[in-house]
């Protein structure tokens, strides 16, 4: 086996040239580049039915530079890739593959959830909302006066909206019905309805004194003795203290 | 005509290190890339690595902590050291020569020679 | 490293007879596939390179197909001489490996 003489081959490529343009160091006629001047990649360039030898300085779409001691190439991303940072890092897949962790994946893993705009597989959002504000005043028709029985409403703020598998967001604002002493609307705050309203009562009583001038029960309602005053005003506490109680129990909440 | 002639011991004891020389004739070592290519008896070949026309090496990562590919110019020789050989080392060893990704791979080869490890 | 797996291993025919034999890479080579002759007590001999170009000189019953990962070498009509081993090689990247072998032997 340790001949002294080595097999004689005929030169594979005798058009083999050193004046090669773009780029190439060594090409040929049929071939095009066969080697690549230094910091240029070589790659097969398909131009229908034949593959010619080409040099570029980056590699087209679909592959990534491989650098080997005077020897540089474009390879070819993972038949599932469209662009590549190396053989085992892609970074944008090929249509109906999701990308995640530099992979290809038809499906994304258990926890992530593919995004259709970016073709990623991404974290699964759930919604988050603040705290709830303090309820509001007890009010009705607008108003802090004038009635009873009214409602009163407190809100909260969506912080992060959700990802398509993502919790929904909870309702961020509540209502509930709230009891509350009457009091009569001073001047300011009496609105047009309010106005028309005491006129009306105002008509209806002035009738109904007219009407009964000489009755004694006209005048009961308007002249009070202190025991009698003393008597309404505990008698008052006593439904107040009644209407707390039942406003704790029964706190009616409406959601929108 | 190109031509390749290995030569060096055909016969290394184990741990020692294998040393071939592969004289190259009618093209120079400073264009192309040279390589080392063996076959253990009955199997089939491997590749283990080149130096560039400039002189830079690269070796298979199986191999690549025993071998060592250097070249004198002026010879328009290259060589191949392979350390702490054993029995598993002994191979045809051939050199070859490509000159690009565009062209024939090792479309010249030399006629090869036998290294046998034994004690 | 990107293996080679060629097949059959070896394979009996006659002179006439067309004979295929495949390599299958581990992935995509792009095209970057040699395919070679080996003579027993012989260095090899390059007969197709970039998956279907001959090397000058070599009869074009000999040729090369594939892409990808698949890759054929196929001998449209066996001739004497052309009873040897054959292997594939990959280069698309480094390091770089053959396939284990085909032997063509007369049947």
């Known amino acids: 086996q340790n001949a002294s003489r080595g097999r004689r081959q005929r030169r594979m490529h005798p058009n083999v040239s050193q004046g090669c343009q773009g780029g190439c160091a060594t090409c040929s006629d049929y071939n095009g580049c066969l080697s690549c001047k230094p910091r240029l990649f070589f790659v097969l360039e398909r131009i229908g039915m034949k593959q010619i030898g080409v040099c570029l300085s980056s590699c087209p779409s679909g592959y990534y530079g491989t650098r080997y001691p005077d020897i540089n190439k474009c390879t070819k991303c993972k038949v599932d890739c469209d662009t590549c940072f190396n053989k085992n890092f892609c970074t944008k897949c090929k249509s109906g593959f999701y990308l995640h962790l530099g992979k290809c994946l038809d499906s994304c893993p258990e926890g992530l959830e593919a995004n259709n705009h970016t073709m990623e597989c991404v974290s699964i959002v759930h919604c988050e909302a603040s705290e709830w504000s303090p309820w509001s005043p007890c009010m009705k028709k607008g108003k802090t006066c004038g009635f009873k029985r009214g409602t009163e409403t407190r809100v909260r703020d969506i912080l992060q909206h959700p990802s398509a598998k993502g919790n929904l967001c909870p309702p961020t604002s509540e209502t509930r019905t709230c009891i509350v002493q009457r009091k009569k609307c001073s001047k300011g705050e009496r609105g047009k309805k309010g106005r028309e309203r005491k006129r009306k009562k105002l008509n209806k009583e002035e009738r109904k004194e007219t009407s009964s001038s000489s009755d004694s029960k006209g005048l009961e309602s308007s002249i009070e003795t202190p025991d009698q005053q003393e008597n309404k005003e505990r008698q008052q506490q006593q439904k107040r203290r009644a209407r707390d109680k039942q406003q704790k129990s029964v706190s009616v909440s409406t959601v929108h | 005509e190109v031509q390749l002639v290995e030569s060096g011991p055909g016969l290394v004891k184990p741990s020692e290190t294998l040393s071939l020389t592969c004289t190259v004739s009618?093209?120079?070592?400073?264009?192309?890339?040279w390589n080392w290519i063996r076959q253990p008896p009955g199997k089939g070949l491997e590749w283990i690595g080149y130096?560039?026309?400039?002189?830079?090496?690269y070796q298979n990562p199986s191999l690549k902590s025993r071998v060592t590919i250097s070249r004198d110019t002026s010879k328009n020789q290259f060589s191949l050291k392979l350390s702490s050989v054993t029995a598993a080392d002994t191979a045809v060893y051939y050199c070859?020569?490509?000159?690009?990704?565009?062209?024939?791979?090792?479309?010249?080869w030399g006629q090869g020679t036998l290294v046998t490890v034994s004690s | 490293d990107i293996q080679m797996t060629q097949s059959p291993s070896s394979l009996s025919a006659s002179v006439g007879d067309r004979v295929t034999i495949t390599c299958k890479a581990s992935?995509?080579?792009?095209?970057?596939l040699s395919w070679f002759q080996q003579k027993p007590g012989k260095a090899p001999k390059t007969l197709i390179y970039?998956?279907?170009r001959l090397v000058d000189g070599v009869p074009s019953r000999f040729s090369g197909s594939g892409s990808g990962t698949d890759y054929t070498l196929t001998i449209s009509s066996l001739q004497p001489e052309d009873f040897a081993t054959y292997y594939c090689?990959?280069?698309?990247?480094?390091?770089?490996?053959f396939g284990q072998g085909t032997k063509v032997e007369i049947k």
């Open positions: 070859a020569t490509y000159y690009g990704y565009g062209g024939p791979w090792f479309a010249y």
């Open positions: 009618g093209d120079s070592i400073t264009s192309g890339y």
């Open positions: 130096i560039s026309y400039s002189g830079k090496t």
């Open positions: 992935q995509d080579i792009d095209s970057y």
């Open positions: 970039l998956t279907n």
């Open positions: 090689l990959h280069y698309d990247e480094f390091p770089l490996t």
